[in-house]
Amino acid sequence: MKVLQEPTCVSDYMSISTCEWKMNGPTNCSTELRLLYQLVFLLSEAHTCIPENNGGAGCVCHLLMDDVVSADNYTLDLWAGQQLLWKGSFKPSEHVKPRAPGNLTVHTNVSDTLLLTWSNPYPPDNYLYNHLTYAVNIWSENDPADFRIYNVTYLEPSLRIAASTLKSGISYRARVRAWAQCYNTTWSEWSPSTKWHNSYREPFEQH
């Protein structure tokens, strides 16, 4: 049994880091493998993660961690029974993938403006809370070409767009994802999408 693709890990910079790797053949990850991880710090204890299968030869492990700080560094040991398959380290602050935003809502009753709001996925005491920016994806269910991404570079988890910039009388969907420039993170996963019917009313023409 050998590791084909070494573990790569990302942290949500809160409580979970996720490590993925591939073995050289079909593997029952949960029965055959264990991933041990330990904070490099005086008196810290080792923890064991039981991996799950992620495709035929792929494994994934969700490492539970206490509140992460930028200096944290973990040793990682991948074991198959008594055999050490791989040894490495992981610094969560250098491999951050934020949590996905939630509670995306489209408010269609604000005159002729669409107001999209969502929730910051972090509590106020987490460092990322005040460092997330967002991308909002809006697309038409009728026209595959009509697929837009709005970059929200301010901190407020909301976006206002004129309803008239979208086509009237058809259905749209929206979703949102987050990233943090300060840690050069990857993008989060997309939030669940939400759907609405765009029924923009033309203003009365005055001649």
């Epitope: 026209d143 697929f147 837009r148 004129a162 008239s164 910039t165 979208l166 086509k167």
Partner: antibody, heavy 122, light 107 residues
């Protein structure tokens, strides 16, 4: 900075096929927030959108009704370009042909190629 | 398809004066309308999108207004480089369509 560079012959014989290519730099033909368009301009017809190709987890093409039976627009991801083929041309297809990028918030044309005058004549 | 009609076909204005160009759509295009400037031998250049938003690098003397079927492009104080042909274009419904153009010439 996005740039579109057109290439192809300026003279095509009637009943033959007009072929033009648009090379993209500064963006990707596989972008999911762009469309890649061919537009032509003639004194008789003005500016006319002929068709477009775009990627949204799979490739799509849309064509104007006036040329639908004769036109093909194909992306080439390996060369980051897209092409126009217009079959069975007649002198009425004589025009300046432009490629252009349609962009994100509704797909207006924000970058254009330099234009190619194509004359259909024997 | 949506027919775009521009007026006037030709507009003669003196440098420094204001120019107002009109565009009408045969059916509503919401605010999915763009304006382009074209000079001889050149490709069209995007000026305005979303009926009223200036494209990157476009001077503030260019402004757009309108929604639905009636649109206006205003150039507040004409400079010598502004004399050209101007086109409106709807991108609400495929196929996207252009107006026939307004030629802005020096009076």
């Amino acid at each position: 900075q996005v740039q579109l560079q057109q290439s192809g012959p300026g003279l095509v014989k009637p009943s033959q096929t007009l072929s033009l290519t648009c090379a993209i730099s500064g963006d990707s033909v596989s972008s999911n927030i762009a469309t890649w368009n061919w537009i032509r301009q003639s004194p008789s017809r003005g500016l006319e959108c002929l068709g477009r190709t775009y990627y949204r987890s799979k490739w799509y093409s849309d064509y104007a009704v006036s040329v639908k039976s004769r036109i093909t627009i194909n992306p080439d991801t390996s060369k980051n370009q897209f092409s126009l083929q217009l079959n069975s041309v007649t002198p009425e297809d004589t025009a300046v042909y432009y490629c252009a990028r349609g962009w994100n918030y509704g797909y207006y044309f924000d970058y254009w190629g330099q234009g190619t005058l194509v004359t259909v004549s024997s | 398809e949506i027919v775009m009609t521009q007026s006037p076909a030709t507009l003669s204005v003196s440098p420094g004066e204001r120019a107002t160009l009109s565009c009408r759509a045969s059916q509503s295009v919401s605010s999915n309308l763009a304006w382009y400037q074209q000079k001889p031998g050149q490709a069209p250049r995007l000026l305005i999108y979303g009926a009223s938003t200036r494209a990157t690098g476009i001077p503030t003397r260019f402004s757009g207004s309108g929604s639905g079927t009636e649109f206006t492009l205003t150039i507040s104080s004409l400079q010598s480089e502004d004399f050209a042909v101007y086109y409106c274009q709807q991108y609400n419904n495929w196929p996207y369509t252009f107006g026939q153009g307004t030629k802005l010439e020096i009076k």
